[in-house]
């Protein structure tokens, strides 16, 4: 006669997290008398999953009624599968004794758990950078299984190529994490730009997960400064204009200095947005020429987003403005810091 066989027909079973897994096991004989036990893993450290004879296993139910006469089907169903349940499960026949004696094991069934990746989280640089600089964005997603995963980066719909991606751990694990870094070269037009991290996985059925980051959080567009003087008014006052254009973000402080002394400080607020997402701001200063004997040196000082101040200075020539006549003299630029220095 043939000796007892413990048959586990499937070498592997793959189940989605949250579903139930059925692990099949049949025996070829009811003899010898003794229980079937299910273990995860082999060797001394194996974990008992189910014991027909005794114990309470709330997530495990036998597929067939184990008390049924002549039952030789010892398949089990494990409910609410999580990635932690992954492993190789062995159906083991014991011979009745004190203690029971292990008689024969099935070949094992490897349970792999298909777990969805978490929503990708995209983080940008800690500090803003200006156009022509390269910034890095990081995308992270966790808890997925199996290990195979695809991650792509897009900027305004165009795929990025300067990308470095790692999936951890390198060896076998119940679940995996992915971390990817994309390097993006900024342009002045990127205030409205967006980077997208797109993750595709077998569990997502062709509907990838996306994480986004707005470049507006990463970019600083420094202002252009232009100072002009309007024509003399009848009351001997000169209207001087400081035009601050194409800057982002809005956080900007403008200070007027007359001959080095602070005349007025203003903070930009509630400015209308340009089409490209930048802002413009114009500030006026009225200078009473008749109150000055000498030329007046005016400075428009702009501090943008915590960066070092940018100045535009010019002189109003008092001698060029006889009190009885008005003229349209252009401002004389004495300091022409066109750019911030970083």
């Amino acid at each position: 006669e043939e000796e007892l066989q413990v048959i586990q027909p499937e070498k592997s079973v793959s189940v989605a997290a949250g579903d139930s897994a059925t692990l099949n096991c049949t025996v070829s004989s009811l003899i010898p008398v003794g229980p079937i036990q299910w273990f995860r893993g082999a060797g001394p450290g194996r974990e008992l999953i189910y014991n027909l004879k005794e114990g309470h296993f709330p997530r495990v139910t036998p597929v067939s009624d184990p008390t049924k006469r002549n039952n030789m089907d010892f398949s089990i169903r494990i409910s609410n599968i999580t990635p932690a349940d992954a492993g190789t499960y062995y159906c083991v026949k014991f011979r009745k004794g004190s203690p029971d004696v292990e008689l024969k094991s099935g070949a094992g069934t490897e349970l792999s758990v298909r777990a969805k990746p978490s929503a990708p989280v995209v983080s940008g640089p800690a500090v803003r950078a200006t156009a022509e600089h390269t910034v890095s964005f990081t995308c992270e997603s966790h808890g997925f299984s199996p290990r195979d995963i695809t991650l792509k980066w897009f900027k305004n719909g165009n795929e990025l190529s300067d990308v470095q991606t790692n999936v951890d751990p390198a060896g076998k694990s119940v679940s995996y994490s992915i971390r990817s870094t994309a390097r993006v070269v900024l342009t002045r037009r990127d205030v409205h730009s967006q980077v997208i991290c797109e993750v595709a996985h077998v569990t997502l059925q062709g509907d990838p997960l996306r994480g986004t980051a707005n470049l507006s959080e990463a970019i600083r567009v420094p202002p252009f400064l232009e100072v002009t003087q309007q024509s003399m008014r009848a009351d001997n006052q000169v209207n001087v204009t400081c035009q601050v254009t194409k800057f982002y973000p809005q956080r900007l402080q403008l200070t007027w200095l007359e001959n080095g002394n602070v005349s007025r400080t203003e903070m930009a607020s509630a400015l209308p947005e340009n089409k490209d997402g930048t802002y413009n701001w114009t500030s006026w200063l009225l200078v009473n020429v008749s109150a000055h004997r000498d030329d007046v040196k005016l400075t428009c000082q702009v501090e943008h987003d915590g960066q070092p101040a940018v100045n535009k200075s010019f002189s109003v020539k008092v001698s060029a403005h006889p009190k009885e006549q008005g003229s349209n003299t252009a401002a004389e630029n004495t300091g022409t810091n066109e750019r911030n220095i970083y």
């Epitope: 006669e1 043939e2 009811l30 003899i31 010898p32 008398v33 002549n70 009745k96 004190s98």
Partner: antibody, heavy 115, light 111 residues
């Protein structure tokens, strides 16, 4: 689906006997066959179970005097060194106890040990 | 070896009565449930009624039920029928595979 015993009869003390248990309607290959006896007017007494190869076991009182074997259709039990107290009806039943209880049973065969 | 003690050894009852037979093991039976009940009528082979302490065998009327665990077990016939007058045996299994012992039997007679 039944079991039929045979081989019983009159035997002298110290003698031997071979009992047969033949299955019809099912195979014995995946089941144990257990033997139970009942002395006249007495209760049931478990003797042993015949499985496959090494998987054959007998109650402590029956070890050494009783042995067994089995094919896919017939189980055998050899009774040796018989004594008068072995006089009983011998039943065979399919099963090995616990989750494989004794069912069905044969009709029994009477063994009489007497000089 | 495990010793099974049945009580009572005999009882008289009428049709329709509720009958209870107990079986006590000298030690916990294997798996706390290695206990079967058999019915035997004169001149016949025993018949399986209950196994694994409380599982009703196929074809057995539902008036028969088994309960208990460890060392103490009960067979109950909820409403005795004429065909139920017979001798009832418990069979307990110890931890050793050859350690199977019948109780001495309970004879149920007509009152």
């Amino acid at each position: 689906r039944q079991l039929v015993e045979s081989g019983g009869g009159l035997v002298q003390p110290g003698g031997s006997l071979r009992l047969s248990c033949t299955a019809s309607g099912f195979s014995l290959s995946s089941h144990g066959i257990s033997w139970v006896r009942q002395a006249p007017g007495k209760g049931l007494e478990y003797i042993g179970t015949i499985g496959t190869g090494v998987i054959t076991y007998f109650a402590s009182w029956a070890k050494g005097r009783f042995t067994g074997s089995k094919t896919s259709s017939t189980a055998y039990m050899e009774l040796s060194s018989l004594r008068s107290e072995d006089t009983a009806v011998y039943f065979c039943a399919r099963g090995s106890a616990w989750n494989d209880p004794f069912d069905p049973w044969g009709q029994g065969t009477l063994v009489t040990v007497s000089s | 070896d495990i010793v099974m003690t049945q009580s009572p050894s005999s009882l008289s009852a009428s049709v329709g009565d509720r009958v209870t037979i107990t079986c006590q093991a000298s030690q916990s039976v294997y798996g706390n449930n290695d206990l079967a009940w058999y019915q035997q009528k004169p001149g016949q082979a025993p018949k399986l009624l209950i196994y694994l302490a409380s599982t009703l065998a196929t074809g057995v009327p539902s008036r028969f039920s088994g309960s208990g665990s460890g060392t103490d077990f009960t067979l109950t016939i909820s409403s005795l029928q004429p065909e139920d007058f017979a001798t009832y045996y418990c069979l307990g299994g110890g931890d050793d595979e050859a350690d199977n012992t019948f109780g001495q039997g309970t004879k149920v007679e007509i009152k």
